[in-house]
Interface confidence: medium
């Protein structure tokens, strides 16, 4: 199958908001944990027929491996469950979500695994180079979104310790050949390119050699241009609030957008006793919008001071870019101060939003 179909790769971890579209998620689990991967469709609707794949092979459901169209669970995980997982559309093999899973013997800090493949004393007197971790070199085709970091690895050994060099499309590859340069980590047998761009596409070959021989491995890199999308608003924000009369309230709205977003805070109002106009559009008043001196960070917070009963109602965070609009709403309930004091006597605390 062609890995060229791997565009708009999205990672989602179960129970937590996933990263922005375009990211491959790196997940670390402890041995014995349950690995849970979730791949919800964009927009929340049903997804087309999917298959879950690990290191290029379709996963077969079992008592330990629970497979659903939008969710994968691997119970009692072990080191062998580490690898590259993807959720793919069945017919086209298009990758919808992609995860890199590492299962460690102990709970991990999530540090990078550099250093694992340093040259080691193999006990061999003399010998030609050989791959020490061939299972880590299976993924010969790599499709990543632009702006991601790519690392190619060719962990090897031999005696004397071999040298490693890199070619791009069959020619010597050096840092000056790309904007942003490259990182050659000889002790980790790796080539690292940060913030990849479409011109980084090509075939990358590691050449490992000593006086007894030479081995090489070629990887193909495809850099996928980001699909534009309307702003993404963090789930659960803004949150409903309950406040005491006269207190201060803050609503928060977290906006993710490739294109420059325009953020507005709206309050829903009634006109002649109606909340919506003849066309079904809600009546709103703009409370906060971008001005000459406002930053995006400032716009992500709506502050209400000394709230009155008139401030109660529905508030909406509206974010738009050149692609479209997204909005999330929340309600503010304003309670009279004396009711709050009664609650305080009964519950032993005052909840003021």
């Amino acid at each position: 199958e062609s890995l060229g179909t791997e565009q708009r790769v999205v990672g989602r971890a179960a129970e937590v908001p996933g990263p922005e579209p375009g990211q491959q998620e790196q997940l670390v689990f402890g041995s014995g944990d349950a690995v849970e991967l979730s791949c919800p469709p964009p927009g929340g609707g049903p997804m087309g027929p999917t298959v879950w794949v690990k290191d290029g092979t379709g996963l077969v459901p079992s008592e330990r491996v629970l497979v659903g169209p939008q969710r994968l669970q691997v119970l009692n995980a072990s080191h062998e469950d580490s690898g590259a997982y993807s959720c793919r559309q069945r017919l086209t093999q298009r990758v919808l979500c992609h995860f890199s899973v590492r299962v460690t013997d102990a709970p991990s800090s999530g540090d990078d695994e550099d250093g694992e493949d340093e040259a080691e004393d193999t006990g061999v007197d003399t010998g030609a180079p050989y791959w020490t971790r061939p299972e880590r070199m299976d993924k010969k085709l790599l499709a990543v979104p632009a702006a991601n970091t790519v690392r190619f690895r060719c962990p090897a050994a031999g005696n004397p310790t071999p040298s490693i060099s890199w070619l791009k499309n069959g020619r010597e590859f050096r840092g000056e050949h790309r904007i942003g340069g490259i990182k050659l980590r000889h002790q980790q047998w790796s080539l690292v390119m940060e913030s990849v761009v479409p011109s980084d596409r090509g075939n990358y070959t590691c050449v490992v050699e000593n006086k007894f021989g030479s081995i090489r491995q070629t990887y193909t890199l495809d850099v996928l241009e980001r699909s534009p999308h309307r702003p993404i608003l963090q789930a659960g924000l803004p949150a409903n609030q309950t406040a005491v009369l006269g207190s201060d309230v803050e609503f928060h709205c977290k906006v993710y957008s490739d294109a420059q977003p325009h953020i507005q805070w709206l309050k829903h109002v009634e006109v002649n006793g109606s909340k919506v106009g003849p066309d079904g559009t809600p009546y709103v008043t703009v409370l906060k919008t971008a001005g000459a001196n406002t930053t995006d960070k400032e716009l992500e917070v709506l502050s209400l001071h000394n709230v009155t009963f008139e401030d109660a109602g529905e508030y909406t965070c509206l974010a738009g870019n050149s692609i479209g609009f997204s909005h999330h709403s929340a309600w503010l309930v304003v309670l009279p101060a004396e009711e709050e004091l009664v609650e305080a006597d009964e519950a032993g605390s005052v909840y003021a939003g």
Epitope: S2, G4, T5, Q7, R8, P41, P42, G43, G45, P46, M47, G48, P49, T50, P69, Q89, R90, L91, T92, R94, L96, D222, L224, E225, S227, P228
Partner: antibody, heavy 119, light 108 residues
Framework: EVQLVQSGAEVKKPGESLKISCKGS????????IAWVRQMPGKGLEWMGI????????RYSPSFQGQVTMSADKSIRIAYLQWSSLKASDTAMYYC????????????WGQGTLVTVSS | EIVLTQSPGTLSLSPGERATLSCRAS???????LAWYQQKPGQAPRLLIY???SRATGIPDRFSGSGSGTDFTLTISRLEPEDFAVYYC?????????FGQGTKVEIK
């Protein structure tokens, strides 16, 4: 606004070759599959195959494998459907359609290209 | 391949009436991977429903889809003049993707 605009109607003789086109705009053309669907006169819809303009990966319906060729030029945002030797039975309306994000249903359609093959 | 059979072939109704269109699959359509399209004379099809019951963007709520397995239904609660057209179901759960032969909804 997502739009798929197809080339104009064609009248051909049996044995002739033909290439019709579908130009996408208003979205990331290289990031969505394009399908081709045939509708013979007075009949229903038949799925022919799909192409991913990002790398020209193609998948054909078994009924159309070897009968037509799908291609794409991402630099000009156009997908193509071509025949090397037309038959009278190829007379039909041909639609291109964009597949949704998950590559399943057809969310936007072109206006169709009528191909008439007659001696 | 999965064969989709739509019934009735033609449905004659008046504006304001309720239309119920059926789509039956020759074998189970996994996870309700079924879509409905509307096609008017001289026009391209238009997506109405996907995932058996999810309305596509901009589709009025008088259109609803239901069903699972082998039996699926498209319901138009109150027919408007612009709803008279041909309706096709399509499954995308198994390759090759297939369409039903269509149901024509005509004015009585």
């Amino acid at each position: 606004e997502v739009q798929l605009v197809q080339s104009g109607a064609e009248v051909k003789k049996p044995g002739e070759s033909l290439k019709i086109s579908c130009k996408g705009s208003g979205y990331s053309f290289t990031s969505y599959w394009i399908a081709w669907v045939r509708q013979m006169p007075g009949k229903g819809l038949e799925w022919m195959g799909i192409i991913y303009p990002g790398d020209s990966d193609t998948r054909y319906s078994p009924s159309f494998q070897g009968q037509v060729t799908m291609s794409a030029d991402k630099s000009i945002r156009i997908a193509y459907l071509q025949w090397s030797s037309l038959k009278a039975s190829d007379t039909a309306m041909y639609y291109c359609a964009r597949l949704d994000y998950s590559g399943s249903w057809f969310d936007y359609w072109g206006q169709g290209t009528l191909v008439t093959v007659s001696s | 391949e999965i064969v989709l059979t739509q019934s009735p072939g033609t449905l004659s109704l008046s504006p304001g009436e309720r239309a119920t269109l059926s789509c039956r699959a020759s074998q189970s359509v996994s996870s309700s991977y079924l879509a409905w399209y509307q096609q008017k004379p001289g026009q391209a099809p238009r997506l109405l429903i996907y995932g058996a019951s999810s309305r596509a963007t901009g589709i009025p709520d008088r259109f609803s889809g239901s069903g699972s397995g082998t039996d699926f239904t498209l319901t138009i609660s109150r027919l408007e003049p612009e709803d008279f057209a041909v309706y096709y179901c399509q499954q995308y759960g198994s390759s090759p993707w297939t369409f039903g032969q269509g149901t024509k909804v005509e004015i009585k």
